[in-house]
């Protein structure tokens, strides 16, 4: 059986400030068992954006219903984007472990760029 791959089909996404960003991610297999997490950045300082296993992340919604047992679509939407959200986002599959889950495979990353809202200048005559 082929090993699970984490596919992030979009190398980059451009979103206007105030809009919603969709970051796409799919897994090619249900095995191994374990959660998906999304991070901004890589390495030890990376920022957790969404964790399938724990917590409620008010700005993040999943595109698919992750409670469905055969789901392999782990795409997310992040609402009300600001320039501070710019960066590279990684979809990471974890393998169930004891006591802690173990990072198994990461997607290649999607770079989110934020286009500033056009400012409306009022000209006084």
């Amino acid at each position: 059986e082929e090993e699970l791959q984490v596919i992030q089909p979009d190398k980059s996404v451009l979103v206007a400030a105030g809009e919603t960003a969709t970051l796409r991610c799919t897994a090619t297999s249900l095995i191994p068992v374990g959660p998906i997490q999304w991070f901004r950045g890589a390495g030890p300082g990376r920022e957790l954006i969404y964790n399938q296993k724990e917590g409620h992340f008010p700005r993040v919604t999943t595109v698919s219903d992750l409670t469905k047992r055969n789901n392999m679509d782990f795409s997310i939407r992040i609402g009300n984007i600001t320039p501070a959200d710019a960066g590279t986002y990684y979809c990471v599959k974890f393998r169930k472990g004891s006591p802690d889950d173990v990072e198994f495979k990461s997607g290649a990353g999607t770079e989110l760029s934020v286009r500033a809202k056009p400012s409306h200048h009022h000209h006084h005559h």
């Epitope: 959660p35 724990e54 917590g55 409620h56 999943t62 219903d65 992750l66 409670t67 469905k68």
Partner: antibody, heavy 120, light 107 residues
Framework: EVQLVESGGGVVQPGRSLRLSCAAS????????MIWVRQAPGKGLEWVAS????????YYADSVKGRFTISRDNSKNTLYLQMNSLRAEDTAVYYC?????????????WGQGTMVTVSS | DTQLTQSPSSLSASVGQRVTITCGAS??????MHWYQQKPGKQPKLLIY???NLEAGVPSRFSGSGSGTDFTLTISSLQPEDFATYYC?????????FGQGTKLEIK
């Protein structure tokens, strides 16, 4: 077989404290978020508190915030609810339940409940 | 908070009858609505999760549908063991909330 067994209920005076326990067996406790739900006599279900698998995320109902504390010991497969400053309106059957993975998942197994009566 | 309103609050029906219980949410909960059955003196039991998914071991006469704010639990042909109280519950956002319950009684 999945089992959740609550204990620690009883009769207590208003203002006093009580600690409920929920002993889990038949599944990998550390994989599951856990929840306390209560049911006042003759009433419906009310969510009280929830705790994620590693205790990183904890939520409380407004009605118990600041008075109740949910915790877990994964090495003992046990969930706890520390209830302080108890009020008459806390009188209820308290159920523990498990929730697979994240916040959106349902409560798929429940304990049989333990009765807490707050009365002077 | 997301308020859930079940209808009807109580219902009398006969064995073999088709029964529908509805649950309305005060705002969208997407598909994160679950249904439980509770018999007197017993703990609740999960029937349907995420609007339409039958929990393992639950008879196929139970079904669920809906998304957003309007949800339905249907029992296609009532059996004697189905007389109980049914609750909907949302898990879209904290706090978790339950409907007030629908008591299904034998006619």
């Amino acid at each position: 077989e999945v089992q959740l067994v609550e204990s620690g209920g009883g009769v207590v005076q208003p203002g006093r404290s009580l600690r409920l326990s929920c002993a889990a067996s038949g599944f990998t406790f550390s994989d599951y978020g856990m929840i306390w739900v209560r049911q006042a006599p003759g009433k419906g279900l009310e969510w009280v508190a929830s705790i994620s698998s590693s205790s990183s995320y904890i939520y409380y109902a407004d009605s118990v915030k600041g008075r109740f504390t949910i915790s877990r010991d994964n090495s003992k497969n046990t969930l706890y609810l520390q209830m302080n400053s108890l009020r008459a309106e806390d009188t209820a059957v308290y159920y523990c339940a498990r929730r697979y993975y994240g916040f959106n998942y349902p409560f798929d197994y429940w304990g049989q409940g333990t009765m807490v009566t707050v009365s002077s | 908070d997301t308020q859930l309103t079940q209808s009807p609050s109580s219902l009398s029906a006969s064995v073999g009858q088709r029964v529908t219980i509805t649950c309305g949410a005060s705002k969208s909960v997407r598909t994160y609505m679950h249904w439980y059955q509770q018999k007197p003196g017993k703990q609740p039991k999960l029937l349907i999760y995420s609007a339409s998914n039958l929990e393992a071991g639950v008879p196929s006469r139970f079904s669920g549908s809906g998304s957003g704010t309007d949800f339905t639990l249907t029992i296609s042909s009532l059996q004697p063991e189905d007389f109980a109280t049914y609750y909907c519950q949302q898990s879209n956002e904290p706090p978790y909330t339950f409907g007030q319950g629908t008591k299904l009684e034998i006619k």
